[in-house]
């Protein structure tokens, strides 16, 4: 099995840790973890192209999109590889993350290792909104916290 | 060309940014950057096995050593892949990093992408010391700052 981990940090109170596990190449990736310090509700959750934190979360670039597709939801055929939808925080500001995804991978040409995981200020409308931004970012807003996805033991 | 970047942070004043560039697979990797907040002198500088920052720099594990070799200096045949020797800080606590290395790589089976870059408290004796620790860590001491190596634009 391949394992990865990402420690999310930002300028504000939002922080968290996400663990990734993939039994074998071609198998789904299972994400588990917790993010704290969020406002109640849904927050866009994406893998961004670069593992670059030199300018904070901004330098991570756009959603990881090696196939030049439109933004969508995790269940959509038309989606960025990095489109993992939303995480939902409760009244306590905690989002317990439990995602299984068949598009991201921890190995191969389009591995997410060394890229950036970002949790956003607002909900991701999954490309269904009425403006241009919906087809690019899902209107998820600013980047609250992020971290480079690293190889785990 | 392949590019990577690493933002080094720790619990103390030490911080920095390291840029990596490799023109093609099999070509050397050129490291450039700056680390600040160091004590004057030499500080061990290594790629560690895991890109795991869940317990700070500790969780990065040992030096990246896929060939099960002994610790050495960057010019040695017998070395860990992650053995990049020392960086040298001046009286101002700044180490200007300029390294060219033919053992590390930004691609392939033993890529350093998604692993951790660590700057240490003490000088790395490059495996030439008289104790067991020299053959493992070069007696470089504690981990002052670290960061996961990520893909750059």
């Amino acid at each position: 099995a391949m394992k990865a981990v990402c420690v999310l940090k930002g300028d504000g109170p939002v922080q968290g840790t996400i663990h990734f596990e993939q039994k074998a190449s071609g198998e789904p990736v299972v994400l588990s973890g917790q993010i704290t310090g969020l406002t109640e509700g849904q927050h866009g959750f994406h893998v961004h192209q670069y593992g670059d934190n030199t300018q904070g979360c901004t330098s991570a670039g756009p959603h990881f999109n090696p196939h030049s597709k439109k933004h969508g939801g995790p269940a959509d055929e038309e989606r960025h590889v990095g489109d993992l939808g939303n995480v939902t925080a409760g009244k306590d500001g905690v989002a317990n993350v439990s995602i299984e995804d068949r598009v991201i991978s921890l190995s191969g040409e389009h591995s997410i290792i060394g890229r950036t995981m970002v949790v956003h200020e607002k909900q991701d409308d999954l490309g269904k909104g009425g403006n241009e931004e919906s087809t690019k970012t899902g209107n998820a807003g600013s980047r609250l916290a992020c971290g480079v996805i690293g190889i785990a033991q | 060309a392949m590019k990577a970047v690493c933002v080094l942070k720790g619990d103390g004043p030490v911080q920095g940014t390291i840029h990596f560039e490799q023109k093609a697979s099999g070509e050397p990797v050129v490291l450039s950057g700056q680390i600040t907040g160091l004590t004057e002198g030499q500080h061990g500088f290594h790629v560690h096995q895991y890109g795991d920052n869940t317990q700070g720099c500790t969780s990065a594990g040992p030096h990246f050593n896929p060939h099960s070799k002994k610790h050495g200096g960057p010019a040695d045949e017998e070395r860990h892949v992650g053995d990049l020797g020392n960086v040298t800080a001046g009286k101002d606590g700044v180490a200007n990093v300029s390294i060219e290395d033919r053992v590390i790589s930004l691609s392939g089976e033993h890529s350093i992408i998604g692993r951790t870059m660590v700057v240490h408290e003490k000088q790395d004796d490059l495996g030439k010391g008289g104790n067991e620790e020299s053959t493992k860590t070069g007696n470089a001491g504690s981990r002052l700052a670290c960061g996961v190596i990520g893909i750059a634009q």
């Epitope: 509700g41 607002k122 409308d125 269904k128 909104g129 009425g130 241009e132 087809t135 | -």
Partner: antibody, heavy 116, light 107 residues
């Protein structure tokens, strides 16, 4: 400039059919979910149907399911609403709008009157 | 079906006033709420989506707030062109529904 222009409305008898069209310009039509929203005379707004950018998914309000069909032709930058078995309560101005869940630009609307 | 109660149905105000319009849901909708403005004989225009995000080109005197089941549209300083009918809309679950509207008229 984004433009949505509806056509095809008119007077039709109960049980009859109409096909509404919406011509889109000024944006990449094939990138967007699209919707139809209607407004009965002097009343509020009612979402009717939406369709995914590639036409692979559609959803409808219960009151029109099985009678109305939303479709699109991305090559022609056009959205359609085929309305069958029309009822008096379908009388409304029908708007096409960009977006599948909330609606950005809207067309000017086309009036459908179902009456004998 | 999520039921929406918009209040008031009719609101009389003067230019320069600060006005608020309320929208209450029958169940929580997270932040899946939009606000629209409609002038007589015209199509609606989106003002705000995701509770508080101002649509491009909409004046900053419009703002949205709220969470869960209770949401508010605020116009901080009424201008003459703001007299219109306002609708809230939830897009949390099918069918997507609108409030019954608030007509904002000149006092």
């Amino acid at each position: 400039e984004v433009q949505l222009v509806e056509s095809g409305g008119g007077l039709v008898q109960p049980g009859g059919s109409l096909r509404l069209s919406c011509a889109a310009s000024g944006f990449t039509f094939s990138s967007f979910w699209m919707s139809w929203v209607r407004q009965a005379p002097g009343k509020g707004l009612e979402w009717v149907a939406n369709i995914k950018h590639d036409g692979s998914e559609q959803d409808y309000v219960d009151s029109v399911k099985g009678r109305f069909t939303i479709s699109r032709d991305n090559a022609k930058n056009s959205l359609y609403l085929q309305m069958n078995s029309l009822r008096a309560e379908d009388t409304a101005v029908y708007y096409c709008a960009r977006g599948g869940i909330w609606f950005g630009p809207w067309g000017q609307g086309t009036l459908v009157t179902v009456s004998s | 079906v999520i039921w929406m109660t918009q209040s008031p149905s009719l609101l009389s105000a003067s230019t320069g006033d600060r006005v608020t319009i309320s929208c209450r849901m029958s169940q929580g909708i997270s932040s899946y709420l939009a606000w629209y403005q409609q002038k007589p004989g015209k199509a609606p225009e989106v003002l705000i989506y995701a509770v508080s995000t101002l649509q491009s080109g909409v004046p900053s005197r419009f703002s949205g707030s709220g969470s869960g089941t209770d949401f508010t549209l605020t116009i901080s300083c009424l201008q003459s062109e703001d007299f219109a009918t306002y609708y809230c809309q939830q897009y949390y679950s099918f069918p997507y529904t609108f409030g019954q509207g608030t007509k904002l008229e000149i006092k």
